[in-house]
Interface confidence: medium
């Protein structure tokens, strides 16, 4: 017999199929779309989440000025190729053999090409700027309270080490969260800033990836923080390579 684990679900990823077929009847969960086993004690990689999403049924300025090399995910959803560790493969291609290179968060960083396109390495996104606009409130939030609450959120909900939350800027109604994580800083077991940012983005949109947990209820000193617009900028360790045509468009 087996001591099959009851309540066999994946707390950190609702887009999974779970069954007690792990060692000794332990709960084992596989991501939809890829069928890859996932570690339910931490965040699932963005690549596997995007793949699962595509397989599911369709449903005196203090603010940072994004660098000229900052990328915004304008291409939207696609069905990505993930490596055996669940990371994005450096080169992504669609069904019509159009290919492009992506960074570690899966955002395109080159012009689109054909199957001859070479992407030598998966370039790491080491700096993410999350730009939020909150709905009008009676008064501005206290900056230090806001900072503490957002750091707590990333630590407790997304399990991102506080050292990777580089800064929280606030100029009502705009909030900017800076996440920084160099390759050398990321130890085994550390949540990737790209994965944390993706979970946060989905939470903000009311599309929580967590199993059975309520949606994100962000409060600062009891006052609800309701976000009405989100923009995320991605900065890579090596600047992207786009033709001048795109840059002037």
């Amino acid at each position: 017999h087996t001591a099959a684990q009851d309540n066999c679900t994946c707390p950190t990823n609702k887009m999974t199929v779970c069954s007690p077929d792990g060692p000794g009847g332990r709960c084992q969960c596989r991501a939809l779309g890829s069928g890859m086993a996932v570690d339910c004690s931490t965040l699932t990689s963005k690549c596997l989440l995007l793949k699962a999403r595509m397989s599911a049924p369709k449903n005196a300025r203090t603010l940072v000025r994004p660098s000229e090399h900052a990328l915004v995910d304008n291409d939207g959803l696609y069905d990505p190729d993930c490596d055996p560790e669940g990371r994005f493969k450096a080169r992504q291609c669609n069904q019509t053999s159009v290919c492009w290179c992506v960074n570690s968060v899966g955002v395109r960083r080159t012009d689109k090409g054909d199957l001859s396109l070479r992407c030598d390495e998966l370039v790491r996104t080491h700096h993410i700027l999350i730009d939020l606009r909150h709905r009008p409130t009676a008064g501005a939030f206290n900056h230090s309270d806001l900072d503490a609450e957002l750091r707590r959120l990333f630590r407790e909900r997304y399990r991102l080490h506080p050292k990777f939350v580089a800064a929280v800027h606030y100029e009502q109604p705009t909030i900017q969260i800076e996440l920084r994580q160099n390759t050398s800083q990321k130890a085994a077991g550390d949540v990737d800033i790209g994965d944390a940012a993706y979970y946060f983005e989905r939470d903000i949109k009311g599309e929580s990836l967590f199993q059975g947990r309520g949606g994100l209820d962000l409060r600062v000193r009891g006052e609800p923080l309701q976000v009405e617009r989100t923009l995320i900028y991605y900065l890579d360790e090596i600047p992207p390579k786009f033709s001048m045509k795109r840059l002037t468009a």
Partner: antibody, heavy 122, light 111 residues
Framework: QVQLVQSGAEVKKPGASVKVSCKAS????????MHWVRQAPGQGLEWIGY????????GYNQRFKSRATMTVDKSTSTAYMELRSLRSDDTAVYYC???????????????WGQGTMVTVSS | DIVMTQSPLSLPVTPGEPASISCRSS???????????LHWYLQKPGQSPQLLIY???NRFSGVPDRFSGSGSGTDFTLKISRVEAEDVGVYYC????????FGGGTKVEIK
């Protein structure tokens, strides 16, 4: 550093219940399975069951399924094991043990509590 | 349940000499995912068990390199290359591929 500190020794009468606690520190409590293992005097180790604190999922040895209940209090990082309808042959040292359950887990019990002696005697 | 059989039951050793403990399981311990979840523990007198070797041959952190594990399928061995006085106690093999079970233990004592 990882520490599992268990509650003190208990003396119980046959038919009674005992609830042993195990307070964890030095790691993220919800990330690891907690197992319960017992050892009768001069005997070997016998597995009772485990609980995954993140969502309360449990797995029991069939021998104990009807009498043992494992719970956790996430706010205090404490695991509990209650054993009901005690008999004299339940006299043993009861251990909690953390099991590696992260990415590419070993499923080995890597840290153990100091043990709680439970004596069942009329 | 999987039955884990250890031998010998008792092992008198001389400090500086090697020692070997055998563990046999009633079924293969290779899981469907290819891993073998066979572990070794030492319980020193008056103490809780402590992990020595996990997944057949991996030394747990802080475990001296005189301890090594080997084996596959149903037959496993723990070796101590040069026994030291602090190595006395009861050694248990354990599997977590199926419902966790422990071997009966091997008592290592100094001659």
């Amino acid at each position: 550093q990882v520490q599992l500190v268990q509650s003190g020794a208990e003396v119980k009468k046959p038919g009674a219940s005992v609830k042993v606690s195990c307070k964890a520190s030095g790691y993220t409590f919800t990330d690891y399975n907690m197992h319960w293992v017992r050892q009768a005097p001069g005997q070997g180790l016998e597995w009772i069951g485990y609980i995954y604190p993140y969502n309360g999922g449990t797995g029991y040895n069939q021998r104990f399924k009807s009498r043992a209940t494992m719970t956790v209090d996430k706010s205090t990082s404490t695991a509990y094991m209650e054993l009901r309808s005690l008999r004299s042959d339940d006299t043993a040292v009861y251990y909690c043990a953390r099991e590696d359950y992260g990415s590419s887990p070993s499923y080995a019990m890597d840290y153990w509590g100091q043990g709680t002696m439970v004596t069942v005697s009329s | 349940d999987i039955v884990m059989t250890q031998s010998p039951l008792s092992l008198p050793v001389t400090p500086g000499e090697p020692a070997s403990i055998s563990c046999r399981s009633s079924q293969s311990l290779v899981h469907g995912n290819g891993n073998t979840y066979l572990h070794w523990y030492l319980q020193k007198p008056g103490q809780s068990p402590q992990l020595l070797i996990y997944k057949v041959s991996n030394r747990f952190s802080g475990v001296p390199d005189r301890f090594s594990g080997s084996g596959s399928g149903t037959d496993f061995t723990l070796k101590i290359s040069r026994v030291e006085a602090e190595d006395v106690g009861v050694y248990y093999c354990s599997q977590t591929t199926h419902v966790p079970t422990f071997g009966g233990g091997t008592k290592v004592e100094i001659k």
